[in-house]
Interface confidence: medium
């Protein structure tokens, strides 16, 4: 087989035609990433490589995903005669999978003569440009259109060695050089009308598989020169196996104990130790909506509830800024947890004329939606006149008091002449420090919250000098009804610190809608939940008693098992190939004719949607 | 930082009165409040009286109360701290003090940022 087992995997570049060093820096740096190595995972660049340098642990690599440049050298030959596939993943001036520029010297006869790319049979994405290189002979002869799937792209070759000799008798005029081991192997423009791909002989019974890159020696996918997509066990196939199986059993997907993750171009069973697994893939990192956790001791990256963690420096003692102001109210953004402290000072809001910070568009406050812990204490002496209350904090879960501020405070709160209501709703710990909430004229509410359930001791409350508790019950500022007697953070339901009945997503309702509504529920504890959306909705009744979709009443759609599903299994990955099942009368999944390889309507064999295997055949699994 | 300047103390016999005034310069634009400390000989230093400067809220020690009376000029960025029926044991170096930003509560020594170079009262028995 062409396509080995095992691979030696290396990183490319991407650096263009930037160099750092002289030559010889440069050559070090090119032996050193690529020596040994058969997939270049990412570009190879060859640029300014001198022509006394030996480029010969060149030609064990076999594929390059991303694109190949070569330019500025002055050696005579490529030795990338094993090269097979470039992937052309990333494109050299956003078009070219292939780009051979400038390699002569002007002022001395050192040039590159010959590309040496004899193997080279796909670009699988991406076009060629091969100009101004004095020197270089037969590449007007290769036929690109062979090598380059896209057969909407025009090959650029042009203005490169004009006293070349002919391709040898035997290459029918396409070759990469002049002797008749130069002969170009075409493997697409040859092929009979039936072959979809690639082939290996003219006939109609030549073709490659059509999971091959590059060519073939036979018609099996073992038997490909490179793998179009990926390469399981010199297996070349259209994915790795996936990480979940269908239990016929259970009837739900499971993990897959022989699932292996893609790494490139190659199916593994385990990424290499500096990576991470994201789904089945192989990642130098998690993407921004990910964050990685280690599982029975593989790295992955997992979906974060919301946004992922981040945490940011705060301002005060130990910090570089005294408070918040326009000069890093950016540098919050996204954050989720403040190390250290946040102080809100009237030279934050209003500028500082001394430090020659402007004043801070109070808009901008909201970046504070997603910090749902602060280490140290949260300092509020200015606050933007039309905001009432600070329900930008509204996510903020705990306050630490890891930092304390002036007399040991962890939440200061003062001379806040347009404030309420704090409208701290997610508030439900002050870890350590005092609580100093006084001077605020306007303020009501926080007479009815339980500071004893947030914090340690009653004595670290000193809580004065804020509008009297009669004023606030006069103007009918006061708790929801539907707040239990933990008191409230503000008006309406959703600020309450704990509910007199349930609550739906942070909101206090009087009842869960078990029986009636568009979307129906069920409770755990005192909490509403939506009933999963396959089942179906139940009228004057329970629609479901849990959150699964094994806990529906009745299917919206169909039954597979104990599950209620939106369609019956169709051709999803099983222990022993795809399964296939139809609904009957009563829109429970039954098992297709096991020989059924597209699907059915029924269970038997002349229910098959498409061409059933015949008997002796049998790899598609059923149950 | 705020630049601050007493006057006004000296010897005083037991019942008498004196008027000690702090005015402060610099980067007054963001005063919180201005208040009096004092200390004693072997003494730490305590508060005696604090007003806040944008609504003239005032705050007193228990030992000073309904005998000393702290007042503001805005306009000249001064601060008086009037004191009646002196006693032996007010015998200290008075000083005065302004909190800028950060601000912290008026009574609290660590609340403020700037400090003048203090002015002796004596009270003779």
């Known amino acids: 087989s062409e396509v080995g087992n095992s691979q030696a995997v290396c990183a490319g570049t991407l650096n263009g035609l930037s160099v750092t060093g002289d030559a010889q820096h440069q050559y070090r740096t090119l032996h050193k990433m690529y020596n040994n190595c058969e997939i270049v995972m990412g570009n190879l660049e060859i640029v300014l490589i001198d022509h006394t340098q030996d480029l010969s642990f060149l030609q064990t690599i076999r594929e390059v995903t991303g694109y190949i440049l070569i330019a500025m050298n002055v050696f005579s030959t490529l030795p990338l005669r094993n090269l097979r596939v470039i992937r052309g993943t990333q494109f050299y001036e956003e078009k070219y999978a292939l780009f051979v520029l400038l390699n002569y010297n002007p002022n001395a006869t050192h040039a590159l003569r010959q590309l040496g790319l004899n193997r080279l049979t796909e670009i699988l994405a991406g076009g060629v440009y091969i100009e101004k290189n004095e020197q270089l002979c037969h590449v007007d002869t290769v036929e690109w259109r062979d090598i380059m799937r896209d057969p909407r792209l025009e090959p650029v070759v042009g203005d490169n060695g004009r006293a070349c000799a002919p391709c040898h008798e035997s290459c029918g005029g396409h070759c990469w050089g002049p002797g008749p081991e130069d002969c170009q192997q075409l493997t697409k423009t040859i092929c009979a009308p039936q072959c979809n791909g690639r082939c290996f002989g003219r006939a109609p019974n030549e073709c490659c598989h059509e999971e091959c890159a590059g060519g073939c020696t036979g018609p099996l996918q073992t038997h490909c020169f490179a793998c179009r997509h990926f390469n399981d066990s010199g297996a070349c196939v259209p994915l790795c196996p996936q990480p979940l199986i269908y239990n016929k059993l259970t009837f739900q997907l499971e993990p897959n104990p022989d699932t292996k993750y893609q790494y490139g171009s190659v199916c593994v069973r385990s990424c290499p130790h500096n990576f991470v697994v994201d789904q089945s893939s192989c990642v130098r990192a998690c993407p921004s909506n990910k964050m990685e956790v280690e599982k029975n001791g593989l790295k992955m990256c997992e979906p974060c509830a919301g946004l992922c963690p981040k945490a940011c420096e705060g301002t005060g003692a130990g910090s570089h800024y005294q408070t918040v102001d326009s000069s890093n109210i950016d540098s919050f953004v996204n954050c989720t947890k403040i190390l250290g402290n946040l102080d809100f000072l009237i030279t934050g809001l209003e500028g500082d004329p001394w430090r020659n910070i402007s004043a801070l568009d109070p808009e901008k406050l909201n970046v504070f939606r997603t910090v749902r812990e602060i280490t140290g204490y949260l300092n509020i002496q200015s606050w933007p006149k039309h905001m009432h209350n600070f329900s930008v904090f509204s996510n903020l879960e705990t306050i630490g008091g890891r930092s304390l501020y002036n007399r040991g405070f962890s939440l200061l709160i003062m001379k806040n002449d347009n404030v309420t209501s704090l409208g701290l709703r997610s508030l439900r710990e002050v870890s350590a420090g005092r609580v100093y909430i006084t001077e605020n004229r306007r303020l009501c509410y926080l007479h009815t919250v339980q500071w004893a359930a947030l914090s340690r001791r009653r004595a670290d409350l000193d809580i004065r000098n804020n509008k009297p508790r009669g004023k606030c019950q006069q103007e009918g500022k006061v708790c929801d009804p539907l707040c239990s007697a933990d008191g409230c953070w503000g008006p309406g339901p959703a600020q309450c610190l704990s509910c007199r009945h349930y609550s739906r997503r942070g909101v206090c309702v009087e009842s869960c809608s078990f029986t009636q509504g568009e979307t129906r529920e069920f409770a755990e504890g005192t909490e509403c939940f939506e009933c999963h959306p396959e089942c179906e909705r139940v009228e004057g009744g329970i629609t479901c008693n849990g959150s699964g979709a094994d806990t529906c009443t009745r299917c919206a759609h169909y039954r597979d098992g104990p599950h209620c599903v939106e369609r019956c299994p169709e051709g999803i990955l099983g222990e022993r190939g795809p399964i296939y099942k139809y609904p009957d009368s009563s829109r429970e999944c039954r098992p297709c004719h096991e020989n059924c390889t597209r699907g059915c309507t029924g269970p038997l064999l002349q229910d098959c949607l498409g061409d059933a295997l015949p008997s002796a055949r049998r790899a598609p699994t059923v149950i | 930082e705020v630049q601050l300047v007493e006057s006004g103390g000296g010897l005083v016999q037991a019942g008498g009165s004196l008027r000690l005034s702090c005015a402060a310069s610099?980067?007054?634009?963001?005063?919180?409040?201005m208040g009096w400390f004092r200390q004693g000989p072997g003494k730490d230093r305590e508060f005696v009286a604090a007003?806040?400067?944008?609504?003239?809220?005032?705050d007193y020690a228990d030992s000073v109360k309904g005998r000393f009376t702290i007042s503001r000029d805005n306009a000249k960025n001064t601060v008086y701290l009037q004191m009646n029926s002196l006693k032996p044991e007010d015998t200290a170096v008075y000083y005065c003090?302004?909190?800028?930003?950060?601000?912290?509560?008026?009574?609290?020594?660590?609340?403020?940022?700037?400090w003048g170079q203090g002015t002796q009262v004596t009270v003779s028995s």
């Open positions: 610099g980067r007054t634009y963001y005063l919180n409040a």
């Open positions: 007003i806040d400067w944008s609504d003239g809220n005032k």
């Open positions: 003090a302004a909190d800028t930003p950060p601000w912290g509560p008026m009574i609290y020594i660590e609340s403020y940022d700037s």
